[in-house]
């Protein structure tokens, strides 16, 4: 019962986490900047992974996708990649975990198979959560680094003076959503891995086969495989452990006339 609860809770927590990662990836508020308070209008700029938006005090908002910009920072591309990998792994993990849930019966699926699937999905959730946390942290680091580099820099360019506006960079809502979502996905993954231990059978039942030699004078058979399969020198009763998988040579269960002198 506790295993089912742990697995179910892990699934729900991961589901919420992955939904959060998707939401964070799509959000525009990764970084927010109080840009400029000039005599015309106050301007508020916020940027996401896919587009940049500017909002004026009048309420007018304009957003533009980054595809219009050449040479996007490598860090931004890395963050995009991490978030997408996180979403893809999380989505696959969710699919796998649905079939792994103990409360859902699919055909004659054994507990060992469900345990393996639970472990697989758990690992996927953990990696997904780590990807999201890493992505958000890389972006946050990029913001902090940019802030320290954006001291009012003035230079004269072709056709006038260009001044870097010193803006106050703040972490956008998407960063916090991403951190929390990544954490939830990670926790969900750990819970799935814990549930896996409870799902796995505690001991494997092996088929025991006892072989008896029919005579006292048993000839030594050099180099034969049968020395390891209960024949030849094995005159005493021994349990031979096999996992049910045998080669064609091992199918023979009883001594043949060729085994004896």
């Amino acid at each position: 019962m506790a295993v089912t609860a742990c697995q179910g809770l892990g699934f729900v927590v991961s589901l919420i986490g992955i939904a959060g990662i998707i939401a964070a990836t799509c959000m525009d508020q990764w970084s927010t900047q109080d840009l400029y308070n000039n005599p015309v209008t106050a301007v508020f700029n916020y940027q996401g992974l896919w587009r940049s938006c500017v909002r004026e005090s009048s309420g007018f908002t304009e957003c533009r996708g980054y595809f219009t910009l050449l040479g996007l920072p490598a860090m931004l591309q890395a963050v995009r990649a991490l978030m997408i990998v996180g979403i893809v792994l999380g989505a696959i993990g969710l699919l796998v975990s649905i079939f792994a849930l103990k409360c859902i019966r699919i055909g004659s699926m054994e507990d060992s198979a469900k345990a393996n699937m639970t472990l697989t999905s758990g690992i996927m959730f953990i990696v997904s959560g780590l990807c999201a946390i890493a992505g958000v942290s890389v972006f946050a680091n990029m913001l902090v680094t940019n802030f320290w580099m954006s001291t009012a820099n003035m230079y004269t360019g072709m056709g006038g003076m260009v001044q870097t506006v010193q803006t106050r960079y703040t972490f956008g809502a998407a960063l916090f959503v991403g951190w929390v979502a990544g954490g939830l996905t990670l926790i969900g993954g750990v819970m799935m891995c814990i549930a896996c231990r409870g799902l796995a059978p505690e001991e494997t039942n092996y088929k025991a086969v006892s072989y008896h030699a029919s005579g006292h004078s048993v000839a030594y058979k050099p180099g034969g495989f049968k020395a390891s399969t209960g024949f030849g020198s094995n005159t005493k009763n021994k349990k031979i452990y096999d996992g049910g998988a045998r080669t064609e040579d091992e199918v023979q269960s009883y001594p043949s006339k060729h085994d004896y002198v």
């Epitope: 000039n38 209008t41 940027q47 940049s52 007018f60 003076m161 260009v162 803006t167």
Partner: nanobody, 120 residues
């Protein structure tokens, strides 16, 4: 790198008209605000008129009703239509734009200035 090219300045008689233009080019993502400032001989810099991307405008009291600011967002170009010019409008007119050129890259760019002389 962002460049501004101003044009349209010159000598005009009182009561006459001029049209200034300012074209922005380079790595431009958003231009939230564009404006015209002027500096008369021996005086400080003052805002003449400004316009936001959304169409909000602001004019200096001394030019209200005489000057009209407009912008072409597609061409990233700013215009200032100056009518009923007076001798006190004589100044160097500077184009000023706020440019978002990328993530965390916000620039305030000033033009090289164009001289407007109102004299009979």
């Amino acid at each position: 790198q962002v460049q501004l090219v101003e044009s349209g300045g010159g000598l005009v008689q009182p009561g006459g008209s001029l049209r200034l233009s300012c074209a922005a080019s380079g790595s431009i993502f958003h231009i939230p605000v564009m404006g015209w400032y002027r500096q008369a001989p021996g005086k400080g810099l003052e805002l003449v008129a400004g316009i936001s991307r959304g169409g909000t405008t602001n004019y200096a009291d001394s030019v209200k009703g005489r000057f009209t600011i407009s912008r072409d967002n597609a061409k990233n170009t700013l215009y200032l239509q100056m009518n009923s010019l007076r001798a006190e409008d004589t100044a160097v007119y500077y184009c000023n734009v706020l440019v978002v050129s990328g993530i965390g890259s916000t620039l305030e760019v000033w033009g090289q200035g164009t001289l407007v002389t109102v004299s009979s």
